[in-house]
Amino acid sequence: AGVFELQIHSFGPGPGPGAPRSPCSARLPCRLFFRVCLKPGLSEEAAESPCALGAALSARGPVYTEQPGAPAPDLPLPDGLLQVPFRDAWPGTFSFIIETWREELGDQIGGPAWSLLARVAGRRRLAAGGPWARDIQRAGAWELRFSYRARCEPPAVGTACTRLCRPRSAPSRCGPGLRPCAPLEDECEAPLVCRAGCSPEHGFCEQPGECRCLEGWTGPLCTVPVSTSSCLSPRGPSSATTGCLVPGPGPCDGNPCANGGSCSETPRSFECTCPRGFYGLRCEVSGVTCADGPCFNGGLCVGGADPDSAYICHCPPGFQGSNCEKRVDRCSLQPCRNGGLCLDLGHALRCRCRAGFAGPRCEHDLDDCAGRACANGGTCVEGGGAHRCSCALGFGGRDCRERADPCAARPCAHGGRCYAHFSGLVCACAPGYMGARCEFPVHPDGASALPAAPPGLRPGDPQRYL
């Protein structure tokens, strides 16, 4: 797809004798406008044949009134370019017709009085994307100076606007079978759609490169009407192209709009209203497909079953959006309780808990003794950022619920033997040691390194650990 642009530079009397009379007068002021008609290839320029590549109409020029006795000057021109959008490939060779029309502004009855002032035609070779080409054409005593060019509309590129380029989805490569688009190396070539030259009104395609015809049309490019010989006795006046009074196929018959597009007839053609995700004359172009790699951040692309979506991205954890382009800010949901610091590591979420709290989401309160009972006579002690139970003899565990085996930790030193007792443990010390855990050696002279043993206990006696 692209746009043919025409810039009119001047329209006025040509060189040489026989200057034309001004088209406007004081009695009949007028203004000019231009019409351009484009046809592909080096076809005949007959005005009656359709403008298969398109046509455009300029704005009206300024009102002009001839000064009596003055020769016809270059006439005032409308502002701006004439633009003819083309939807398919630019053919390279084309025929043009440029018509100069006069709109009389006198007080005649009825509608605007339009008359054709001059018509020029020609055949040219032109590559899309090239510079402006200048031209001069003469029609009778009039001369028209103009420039023209063809340019591609993104995503199309190339001299025929047939290469479709789209921004690369992955940094290093294009999709399967698709090349980078020189000179736009950061873009990738996309596949072609219909066969070049396929009739925009009577043909359509569902696969790249094909041209399928609507009912009533045939030929490789759907430009040949099916014979009307099946009509029964023709009645009434007919033209060379109409042999009978059976209405021909309408442009929306058979619905040329693909992908759920709806067709409406326009005064001379048709128009497809495309669902979201599609564009093109027949909604045949998907804005993006899985081949374009539209899913970012490792998302999995699958073709959409819903006509409203050409593809669907299944996003990995931590990403969202139709293209998995948005990192999910999982911390924005404030998953860490009790003032914990949230860390989104991409593959996982972590909570760094404040002192006194624990758990995957800091949901456990460690240092609140209020309402927290320590079993079996234990008492709750706060401090150090963690709560704990000080358990009664014979009990242990976090909440003093476990019955303790006091000898399990081998508390008696120097080979002392441990005996479990209802109130705790008792160590029977080996010779030469004393103390509740047999931790003190007895001096060889019989004196102790410690003060005398409590009354009633001799060294060597079992010591009870209170």
Partner: antibody, heavy 124, light 106 residues
Framework: QITLKESGPTLVKPTQTLTLTCTFS??????????VGWIRQPPGKALEWLAH???????RYSPSLKSRLTITKDTSKNQVVLTMTNMDPVDTATYYC????????????????WGQGTLVTVSS | DIQMTQSPSSLSASVGDRVTITCSAS?????MYWYQQKPGKAPKLLIY???NLASGVPSRFSGSGSGTDFTLTISSLQPEDFATYYC?????????FGQGTKLEIK
Amino acid sequence: QITLKESGPTLVKPTQTLTLTCTFSGFSLSTSGMGVGWIRQPPGKALEWLAHIWWDDVKRYSPSLKSRLTITKDTSKNQVVLTMTNMDPVDTATYYCARIVSFDNDVVSAMDYWGQGTLVTVSS
Amino acid sequence: DIQMTQSPSSLSASVGDRVTITCSASSSVSHMYWYQQKPGKAPKLLIYLTSNLASGVPSRFSGSGSGTDFTLTISSLQPEDFATYYCQQWRSNPFTFGQGTKLEIK
């Protein structure tokens, strides 16, 4: 000077076919951009577009009447013919033909000249 | 189908008044066309391509708008302006007219 004039029967019976002819002068249907359309207006009601035909034989019909309408042109006679089958009393209306101009490929510039209209009554 | 809704359906005004008739399309159209019709006569083109004055139409008539909302304005009503006015779209088949606005003398 551009003129258009409708001709045809003023009275038709139900189920019959109506054939209307628009004869024009001052322009030609062989000229690029020219077309002729048909519009009708039931008594006391609004205008309703029926059909039109272009210089290159592109035709358009009102979808609600498409199965009953046919439009043709005879460029050499400067005539456009509209036929409407299976007439019904609700088709009673004044039928107008008008010139349509399209300088752009698919934009109507104006429907600028109209015929005086012909009243067609459908009654048994 | 694109429905064309004109408002008001009728209005009374005096010579010299400024009158505005609106036409609302049920979906977007590129251009609007306005016609004037007097009893027993064919419609006459007033405005084409939204804002262009047809030849022979006085400059007190003007057209404007875009998308779905369009306006016909008569800046200073004259006796010959009392008639019925119709808008029309050429965007999509059927090429519909509005129901008409009857402009009567007060």
